[in-house]
Interface confidence: low
């Protein structure tokens, strides 16, 4: 179920799957929510630790049991991912942090009159992920009212420093507030060039596009279909970026599909989940559990309810069925995508709906933690 | 909202505008989306206008002037008004609206979490009231959704300010001693939300007050935590599943 409580002065021991710098616990929780394996997180505010390297540290954690031992750490904040939390699942983060400088690659500097204007510029720039703004009272006069647009390899700051009269925040593109607009077109038999930022396996171009949309550095993608001539590249989804923000070239290529991230869409973003079920397809991955259920929809529901499950395969092989129930293979991987996609199987596959934000699950639940 | 500022897109995605279409169409009250098919508002919004089919509910909007005849709206399937509501006392000023069709959630249209039943221990320090209501006592409906940060006031303090009325434990008050910031006419039924541990919760429903933003006259809101049993009972569907965002 959905757990929203935060644990003050507590730090989860072990289970680390990733770490990064975030300005507060809420942003850390959001990164955990969107990380394919993160179930728990711990955050160290500046006041909680003397080690400058670990200040603003956000530690994403996984656990086979869904929980980890808590140790007392003054000032630390820990909590749960919001996977399974329905409408609370959002990559939108509006807060502006005063007295904080979020470091990254500064690729654009301009003078603006307010931090809101700076945030708006970041939101309307295709490459900007976060920003810092030097206020009117910044100690160095030449930097006053400077708006620095930034990005980083992981989409989060490379460092966060306490600095007076500086205000920082994130792009509001995930809030569907970008003025850029987006390209909804899917280009059949066309491959984009430029830099690959990630490679995942997906059953179709639409899943590829959604993954691109929620990847911090993906601006466009190319998907190689299941009939692509090179077998090892079939169902490969290449997430891409470029200096200009658009592909520098595109090559006509049979059995490829290309398109753009939808992060810059105005007013509507795709849900960060994939609800389609793929008949005759087997998704490979690490086995989490195998259970007998009646029907592929129940298999998907079972996967959705098991928080660590990322995708599933429902087998219809005679040896995998007894009476009306067949085997439901609940699976996971390091990146949340299948490690292999096989066709012509007797069964169906699909993804967990744990990140869908339309669920009617009790998304505001706060379970009281026992002492 | 008196003393407020313009909101931005998706800042308050649970805020809805309750409008009536007779000869003309106009905004009358606010409301809060609490589930795919449920809106929570004030009972007094329906005083004299009990007809379900004259109401139009606009969600996912920021600027009332953007509404055209083509703007999608929700219609009411059922109005459920608290059985003990009495205008003369201002008590139990709470109503549920069941929409004819469920709404999809987006960044601009999603529900607000409700408080835990009888929530008295949480100290809320970051509370906001939103609405398209008057910006002064003798004002007019605003086009852009307004927001204002207002501190909660203890019921004891509130009772001192309203000697002629009974401020019950099922009400919550908010305002500044010096006035200047408050809800006003047209904000009724809308949300008083507070952010706690990074999560917004619906603490109050805009109900009443003496004038708007007057010195030492806080706004009075229906305390949602006190009505959780009623909300859950009324929103419970036939399959026994609550159709709104309820706490455990």
């Amino acid at each position: 179920g959905c757990l929203t409580q935060l644990y003050e002065n507590a730090f989860f021991r072990g289970g680390d799957v990733a770490s990064m710098y975030t300005p507060n616990a809420q942003y850390c929780q959001m990164r955990c929510t969107f990380h394919p394996r993160c179930l728990l997180f711990s955050f160290l505010p500046a006041s909680s630790i003397n080690d400058m390297e670990k200040r603003f540290g956000c530690f994403l954690k996984d656990s086979v049991t869904g929980t980890l031992p808590k140790v007392h750490r003054t000032g630390a904040v820990s909590g749960h991912s919001l996977k399974q939390c329905g409408h609370q699942i959002s990559a939108c983060h509006r807060d502006i942090y005063k007295g904080v400088d979020m470091r990254g690659v500064n690729f654009n500097v301009s003078k603006v009159s307010s931090v809101e204007e700076c945030q708006k510029r970041c939101t309307s720039n295709i490459r900007c992920q976060f920003f810092s703004y030097a206020t009117q009272t910044f100690h160095k006069a030449e930097y006053r009212n400077n708006c620095l647009l930034k990005y980083s390899p992981g989409g989060t700051p490379t460092a966060i420093k306490v600095l007076s009269n500086v205000e920082s925040g994130f792009s509001l593109k995930p809030c569907a507030l970008s003025e850029i607009g987006c390209h909804m077109n899917i280009f059949q038999h066309l491959a984009f060039s430029d830099v690959d930022v990630a490679r995942v396996l997906t059953p179709d171009a639409f899943v590829c596009r959604t993954i691109c949309t929620y990847h911090p550095n993906c601006l466009f993608f190319t998907f190689y279909t299941n009939v692509w001539k090179i077998e090892s590249q079939r169902n490969v989804c290449l997430l891409k970026t470029s200096e200009s923000g658009t592909p520098s070239s595109s090559t006509p290529q049979e059995n490829t599909i290309s398109g753009y991230s939808l992060l810059t869409c105005k007013r509507t973003l795709p849900e960060p989940c994939h609800s389609k079920i793929y008949p005759g397809v087997d998704f490979g991955g690490e086995e989490l559990n195998v259970t007998f259920v009646k029907g592929v929809n129940v298999c998907q529901e079972t996967c959705t309810k098991m928080i660590r499950c990322q995708f599933f395969t429902y087998s219809l092989l005679p040896e995998d069925c007894k009476e009306e129930k067949c085997k439901c293979f609940l699976r996971l991987s390091m990146d949340g995508s299948p490690t292999r996609i096989a066709y012509g199987t007797q069964g169906s596959s699909g993804y967990s709906l744990r990140l869908c934000n339309t669920g009617d699950n009790s998304v505001c639940t706060t379970k009281t933690s026992t002492r | 909202i008196v003393g407020g500022t313009n909101s931005s897109w998706g800042e308050w995605p649970w805020q809805v505008s309750l409008q009536v279409k007779l000869t003309a169409q106009r905004h009358l009250c606010g409301g809060s989306l609490i589930g795919h098919q449920w809106v929570l508002t004030a009972a007094h919004c329906f005083d004299g206008l009990p007809l379900q089919d004259v109401w139009r509910i606009y969600s996912g909007i920021l600027n009332l002037s953007d509404i055209t005849k083509d703007t999608p709206f929700s219609q009411i399937k059922e109005i459920i008004i608290h059985q003990n509501y009495k205008v003369s006392e201002g008590n139990h000023d709470i109503a549920l609206i069941k929409l004819q069709a469920p709404l999809n959630y987006t960044e601009f249209q999603k529900p607000i979490c409700l408080p835990s039943k009888g929530d008295t221990s949480t100290i809320y320090t970051n509370c906001w009231v939103t609405g398209w209501g008057f910006s002064k006592e003798k004002g007019e409906i605003q086009n852009i959704l307004q927001k204002v940060n207002i501190p909660l006031v203890t019921n004891e303090e509130c009772q001192k300010r309203y000697q002629d009325y009974k401020i019950t434990q099922r009400m919550v008050c908010a305002g500044y001693k010096e006035g200047g910031k408050d809800a006003c006419k047209g904000d009724s039924g809308g949300p008083l939300v507070c952010k706690h541990n990074g999560m917004w919760r619906l603490v109050g429903i805009t109900s009443w007050g003496e004038g708007c933003a007057r010195r030492e006259q806080p706004g009075v809101y229906t305390k949602v935590a006190e009505y959780m049993d009623w909300i859950l009972e009324k929103t419970q569907s036939s399959d026994g599943k609550a159709q709104m965002q309820s706490p455990a």
Partner: antibody
Framework: EVQLLESGGGLVQPGGSLRLSCAAS????????MMWVRQAPGKGLEWVSG????????VYADSVKGRFTISRDNSKNTLYLQMNSLRAEDTAVYYC???????????????WGQGTMVTVSS | DIQMTQSPSTLSASVGDRVTITCRAS??????LAWYQQKPGKAPKLLIY???TLESGVPSRFSGSGSGTEFTLTISSLQPDDFATYYC????????FGQGTKVEIK
């Protein structure tokens, strides 16, 4: 003391016009929905028209739609009924009324004026 | 439009009698019904609202019941002051009155 005082009634020829007023005192007039109800001599009560507190919403009985206009001036605590194209069947005592208190949808009228007589005759 | 039909039109009774007046709606109005008393030359006076709730200050000998389409006003023991005309009114959809029931001295 709560009071409603109607005025403006009188004798008028068919096709003529008349404007009724209702002066309110003793309560916050602008907060309430106000009504006109009429009663033909020796007959029952008939709801005529209603106006929401802000004045933007008006509703009419079918029998008067298009001929009568209800309005209010909250600054003067006054309710009006402009009656045009009057007919003999509009002859009645016209009461203004409002719902002062109660549970929602308490659209029964618990405060009434004393009424003003309108006679439409040639 | 919702029609309200009252019966009887006239009712002759004596002081101390139990009197019942019925009101029928042309479609369901839930409990959104009020009863009024009117004396000659006077404005109507509210007795009961929401089908069965007694307005404050109204004697307890008056009671109302019913829901949906069938409603009843009962005067348990008729008093001299109760000889008047009684009206029902629905407020489920706009407002409609019944044609009235005159309670006269037998």
């Amino acid at each position: 003391e709560v009071q409603l005082l109607e005025s403006g009634g009188g004798l008028v020829q068919p096709g003529g016009s008349l404007r009724l007023s209702c002066a309110a005192s003793g309560f916050t007039f602008s907060h309430y929905i106000m009504m006109w109800v009429r009663q033909a001599p020796g007959k029952g009560l008939e709801w005529v028209s209603g106006i929401y507190s802000s004045g933007g919403i008006t509703v009419y009985a079918d029998s008067v739609k298009g001929r009568f206009t209800i309005s209010r001036d909250n600054s003067k605590n006054t309710l009006y009924l402009q009656m045009n194209s009057l007919r003999a069947e509009d002859t009645a005592v016209y009461y203004c009324a409002y719902r002062r208190t109660g549970v929602p949808r308490r659209d029964e009228f618990d405060i009434w004026g004393q009424g003003t007589m309108v006679t439409v005759s040639s | 439009d919702i029609q309200m039909t009252q019966s009887p039109s006239t009712l002759s009774a004596s002081v101390g009698d139990r009197v019942t007046i019925t009101c029928r709606a042309s479609q369901s109005i839930s409990s959104w019904l009020a009863w009024y008393q009117q004396k000659p030359g006077k404005a109507p006076k509210l007795l009961i609202y929401k089908a069965s709730t007694l307005e404050s200050g109204v004697p307890s000998r008056f009671s109302g019941s019913g829901s949906g389409t069938e409603f009843t006003l009962t005067i348990s023991s008729l008093q001299p002051d109760d000889f008047a005309t009684y009206y029902c009114q629905q407020y489920n959809t706009y407002w409609t009155f019944g044609q009235g029931t005159k309670v006269e001295i037998k």
